[in-house]
Each structure stands twice: as structure tokens, then as C-alpha cells.
């Protein structure tokens, strides 16, 4: 009976999300493998988040709006492990917007989700950021490694969206 009611709840939750995400990919987790964590298909999952790489070339503002429509934000990178996971799926000859910007050009970088900007957990390429005119951050492959660079916000780039996993 308990299992039946849990399944019914799951199905109704799935139906609720179905209107936003036509297809979800779920995995069982938790100590008793009773919880399901889901990401929209074909998003990838890492820890408690889902990631989507958009190959549509758009400005930073339009990229953020695009993520927002999908219930996400441009990616906020919190750890080296997270960055390493993300970059596995990136093309080395492309650049991708991050959810990091400096809208006033005061070198006060801010994350889209208001996560505090921690200078000790940043992955700027050597010599970057280097221009107060360039107020948005991308991740790209340079000098044999992935890192961040400041660029003009209105220049179209690919982008990475991030959202919390859906738990049902």
C-alpha cells in the first residue's frame, strides 16, 4: 500500500513536470534507493544539478533568457570538479557563456543566482580578466586547458545552462 501511494505520487509529479519537460531521465538514489532524481532529456547530470549545452549563438543577455525559459540559469561553477565535468562535453574550438558578469565594469563579478563570487574558486586564464569593457565571462580552451575569459556581452557565443535536479 505504501509503495502504491508513493508510485501514484511519483506519477502525478511526473505529469506535473511533463508540461515543462516532455521527457525526463531519472535515476534511483538515496540510502534505500527510494528517491528518484531527474534531469530533462537530453540534459546531463552531476551531483545535484542538470546541465544543458546550447549551441545556439546568442548574446549573454539572450543566452540567460534562453536558460530562464527552460527553468534554468547560465551555469554557475562552484568547484574544479564541476568545471571538469562540464568541460568533458564542450568542443575545444568553441566558447561558452557562463552565468558570470560585471555589468558596471567595476570588476565586481557576480553570479546570476547571487552565489557570492569567491576569488579563490575562479578559473580565469592567465592574465584574465583584462578589460573593464568586457563584462561577461566565457569558458574556452586555451594554452592546453579550459579557463575563463572576459568578453563583450553582445557578441554571440554558445552557452551552458544549469538547473537543480528534479526530485520525485
Amino acid at each position: 500500500n505504501f509503495m502504491y501511494s508513493k508510485t501514484v505520487k511519483r506519477l502525478s509529479k511526473l505529469q506535473e513536470y511533463q508540461q515543462y519537460y516532455p521527457s525526463l531521465t531519472c535515476v534511483m538514489e538515496g540510502k534505500d534507493m527510494e528517491d528518484w532524481s531527474c534531469c530533462p532529456t537530453p540534459w546531463t547530470s552531476f551531483q545535484s544539478s542538470c546541465y544543458f549545452i546550447s549551441t545556439v549563438m546568442q548574446s549573454w543577455t539572450k543566452s540567460q533568457n534562453n536558460c530562464s525559459v527552460m527553468g534554468a540559469d547560465l551555469v554557475v561553477i562552484n568547484t574544479k570538479e564541476e568545471q571538469d565535468f562540464i568541460t568533458q562535453n564542450l568542443k575545444i574550438n568553441s566558447a561558452y557563456f557562463l552565468g558570470l558578469s560585471d555589468p558596471k565594469g567595476w570588476r565586481h563579478w557576480q553570479w546570476v543566482d547571487q552565489t557570492p563570487y569567491n576569488k579563490n574558486v575562479t578559473f580565469w586564464h592567465s592574465g584574465e580578466p583584462n578589460s573593464p569593457d568586457e563584462r561577461c565571462a566565457i569558458i574556452n580552451f586555451r594554452s592546453e586547458e579550459w579557463g575563463w575569459n572576459d568578453v563583450h556581452c553582445h557578441v554571440p557565443q554558445k552557452s551552458i545552462c544549469k538547473m537543480k535536479k528534479i526530485y520525485i
Partner: antibody
């Protein structure tokens, strides 16, 4: 007073090359992102190229990508536009302009007087 | 590309009267409360001159008879009391996304 003085325009045959220069004074040139904008006779203004203050990032519209190259020499306070494989539709007055950011966008706040490029056989 | 469409193409206004120029973007050029539209004035034989940035901010040194308004896709430049020196072509421009694009221009003349 800010002054931007373009030079290097002239008559060139289709397929030919031309190098435009823009000498800046009255500004700390090395701190400015710079752009080129052109205006064909009787047509609207068209953005042609942008280069950041350090010269390491350059941007172009598809109409000139691969044919035009923007560069700068901060020691000479000079902006350049190398134009190759010129076409009749590149005929225009070419202006250099200073770029000022505005949040996530920008404005072109100071403009030179322009130099005329005519591509014709 | 974002297409900027200006109207009218030309406008004849009496001295001291109001002139209104419209500009429509093919998609929204707003983000986080700011609109990325600028207005320029170009007199014959001269380069363009920045009048208004961010849809409604008056550039330093520009007379306050010039004003800008609008958001999203629809923007307006208003000259509240036309002066003889305002005879020129006026262009709107979006800087939200490359390639930056300009409107086709509106020629303002004295009636």
C-alpha cells in the same frame, strides 16, 4: 578634446586591398575598445569591426568576416582596418568610433569625420 | 540579426513644434530593466553624433529638448521644440546583440 582622424581611403579595383588608419588624440587610447562603422551612399549605417583595448579580441559581422582585419597600435594611438578582396558593395564612408560600454550593451560615443572608399573598375 | 525599422522615413515639422520618430526592433532588446537602444543625429557631411543611450538616457552636452522612451521592441525619439539646427537624419541602433544594427534613418526637415 577628442579627435579621431581617418585616412587611407581611395579608389580601388574589385578584388584589391586597402588599409585604413585612424589616429586618436585627446583620449587614453589604450583603454578604449574601438570600432569601425561604414555608410554606403544613401544607405543605413553598418557596423564593420570592433577590437578590445588590448587588441586580443576582435569582432566582425558576417559580411566582412575573413576579408577585413581590425588591429591597433597603442604605442602610436592608431587604429587600423585592413580590407582585402574588396567588392563594389564595400564602397562607403568608413568611420572609426570609440566604444563605451553600457551595462551589457554599448554606445559609439566619439566618431571621426570618415574616409571614403570606392571600389570600382 | 535584429532588424531595426524606423518610421517615418521623413518628417517636416514647424519650428518650435514637436517631432516624434519611432523605431521598432524585430525582437526584444531589453534585459534586467535596461533597453539597449541608442539614437544618433547625423547632419549633412558630418559623422553621426550620439544623442540618447539605453533608450532614455540623454548624452552629456545634448539639449534636453531631445528625449527617448520605450522598451522591449518599441522606441521613440522626441524633439519637444524643433530648432533650425535640428535638421538632420536620425538613426536608432541596437547594441543588445552583434551584429549591431541601425535603423534606416528618419530625415527631419522644417515645414
Amino acid at each position: 578634446e577628442v579627435q579621431l582622424l581617418e585616412s587611407g581611403g581611395g579608389l580601388v579595383q574589385p578584388g584589391g586591398s586597402l588599409r585604413l588608419s585612424c589616429a586618436a588624440s585627446g583620449i587614453t587610447f589604450s583603454t578604449y575598445t574601438m570600432s569601425w562603422v561604414r555608410q554606403a551612399p544613401g544607405k543605413r549605417l553598418e557596423w564593420v569591426a570592433t577590437i578590445n583595448s588590448g587588441g586580443d579580441n576582435t569582432y566582425y559581422p558576417d559580411s566582412v568576416k575573413g576579408r577585413f582585419t581590425i588591429s591597433r597600435d597603442n604605442s602610436k594611438n592608431t587604429l587600423y582596418l585592413q580590407m582585402n578582396s574588396l567588392r563594389a558593395e564595400d564602397t562607403a564612408v568608413y568611420y572609426c568610433a570609440t566604444y563605451r560600454p553600457y551595462y551589457y550593451g554599448s554606445v559609439l560615443d566619439y566618431w571621426g569625420q570618415g574616409t571614403t572608399v570606392t571600389v570600382s573598375s | 540579426d535584429i532588424v531595426m525599422t524606423q518610421s517615418p522615413d521623413s518628417l517636416a515639422v514647424s519650428l518650435g513644434e514637436r517631432a516624434t520618430i519611432n523605431c521598432k526592433a524585430s525582437q526584444s532588446v531589453d534585459y534586467d530593466g535596461n533597453s539597449y537602444v541608442n539614437w544618433y543625429q547625423q547632419k549633412p557631411g558630418q559623422p553621426p553624433k550620439l544623442l540618447i543611450y539605453g533608450a532614455s538616457n540623454l548624452e552629456s552636452g545634448i539639449p534636453d529638448r531631445f528625449s527617448g522612451s520605450g522598451s522591449g521592441t518599441d522606441f521613440t525619439l522626441t524633439i519637444s521644440s524643433l530648432q533650425a539646427e535640428d535638421v538632420a537624419v536620425y538613426y536608432c541602433q541596437q547594441s543588445d546583440e552583434d551584429p549591431w544594427t541601425f535603423g534606416g534613418g528618419t530625415k527631419v526637415e522644417i515645414k
